[in-house]
């Protein structure tokens, strides 16, 4: 009686159970009554990560430098390559298939959260009493200089982009 189901790591073909190929190998020919399943190792830059009956191995993921990607972990015959963003770049999507430079916060805005490999810079407007006069992916809004603590007075009010200008107090004779 021919089998209707096979054991783990086997597959049914021509009414008989053949061994699957192990991870890292592809199927060349099915087994017969007289011969075992024939498997061959995947080539360079190819992989198969499961017991299988695939006749072609999968290509390793391509970490395209023109998309800002680099190899984080080199693939093997049993594992895929893992890509990550180059320094100073972050992913454009959850699956991280391309990367772009971190955004800078413009003058008048400061960095609320510094970018990571998976998230962009988060900027916030500088509130009253704070300023930023640079375009930066790292700098937070800075507080206006306190003229009083220097025994000076405000000569020019600060804005979200400029610091206050302090000057000497007018001395009344």
């Amino acid at each position: 009686e021919p089998p209707t189901a096979c054991r783990e790591k086997q597959y049914l073909i021509n009414s008989q159970c053949c061994s699957l190929c192990q991870p890292g190998q592809k199927l060349v020919s099915d087994c017969t009554e007289f011969t075992e399943t024939e498997c061959l190792p995947c080539g360079e830059s190819e992989f198969l990560d499961t017991w299988n009956r695939e006749t072609r191995c999968h290509q390793h993921k391509y970490c395209d430098p023109n998309l800002g990607l680099r190899v984080q972990q080199k693939g093997t015959s049993e594992t895929d390559t893992i890509c990550t963003c180059e320094e100073g770049l972050h992913c454009t999507s959850e699956s991280c298939e391309s990367c772009v430079p971190h955004r800078s916060c413009l003058p008048g805005f400061g960095v609320k959260q510094i970018a990571t490999g998976v998230s962009d810079t988060i900027c916030e407007p500088c509130p009253v009493g704070f300023f930023s006069n640079v375009s930066s992916a790292f700098e937070k809004c800075r507080p206006w200089t306190s003229c009083e603590t220097k025994d000076l007075v405000v000569q020019q009010a600060g804005t979200n982009k400029t610091d206050v200008v302090c000057g000497p107090q007018d001395r009344q004779r």
Epitope: K61, T92, S93, E97, S98
Partner: antibody, heavy 117, light 107 residues
Framework: EVQLVQSGAEVKKPGASVKVSCKAS????????IEWVRQAPGQGLEWMGN????????KYNEKFKGRVTLTADKSTSTAYMELSRLRSEDTAVYYC??????????WGQGTTVTVSS | DIQMTQSPSSLSASVGDRVTISCRAS??????LNWYQQKPGKVPKLLIY???RLRSGVPSRFSGSGSGTDYTLTISSLQPEDVATYYC?????????FGQGTKLEIK
């Protein structure tokens, strides 16, 4: 399925401008850059520039700088290539292509631009 | 710009023949070399990327090799449906540049 659908054929006079559109579907438009390539009749392929819809980053081939403008409308997942000050040598098929998981992995069907007086 | 020179510019071969197309870059492109197939009246299609990686769905009779400045596309056994123009393209340095193409015909 990733698809790039381009606008129809155009006939223009020398000195005019042309704007070719490329509507993307089947993937998240802002994930990958769009490349623009042209092919003059019976000739090879020539890269014009690329545009990343995520951050509007644009790179141009020096040969076309000042004449070509690449833009996109994220709300409609459409990329645009505008070429100004047209001359007869600009008669060509203009292609958009996605630089996706692989280089130039999906192409539009091409837009024929004829420049003739 | 990096110049890409293909040879031959055209060739005629018989079904079943082994066909090779060469591509030379004017400077080292570190394997950043792609091959495209353009059938008459059709859109170019990526065949091979990063010198030797076969795009999924492309018949295994196509292969690529090379390094430095010299690269080769090989068709191990030519089929009638392989009639097309083949282009190499360097992906190493902007502006991306293509070879002038090799037109392949069946004898």
């Amino acid at each position: 399925e990733v698809q790039l659908v381009q606008s129809g054929a155009e006939v223009k006079k020398p000195g005019a401008s042309v704007k070719v559109s490329c509507k993307a579907s089947g993937y998240t438009f802002t994930t990958f850059p769009i490349e623009w390539v042209r092919q003059a009749p019976g000739q090879g392929l020539e890269w014009m520039g690329n545009f990343h819809p995520y951050n509007d980053d644009t790179k141009y081939n020096e040969k076309f700088k000042g004449r070509v403008t690449l833009t996109a409308d994220k709300s409609t997942s459409t990329a645009y290539m505008e070429l100004s000050r047209l001359r007869s040598e600009d008669t060509a098929v203009y292609y958009c292509a996605r630089r996706g998981k692989l280089p130039f992995d999906s192409w539009g069907q091409g837009t024929t631009v004829t420049v003739s007086s | 710009d990096i110049q890409m020179t293909q040879s031959p510019s055209s060739l005629s071969a018989s079904v079943g023949d082994r066909v090779t197309i060469s591509c030379r870059a004017s400077q080292d492109i570190s394997n950043y070399l792609n091959w495209y197939q353009q059938k008459p009246g059709k859109v170019p299609k990526l065949l091979i990327y990063f010198t030797s990686r076969l795009r999924s769905g492309v018949p295994s009779r196509f292969s690529g090799s090379g390094s430095g400045t010299d690269y080769t596309l090989t068709i191990s056994s030519l089929q009638p449906e392989d009639v097309a123009t083949y282009y190499c393209q360097q992906d190493r340095k902007l502006p991306w540049t293509f070879g002038q193409g090799t037109k392949l015909e069946i004898k």
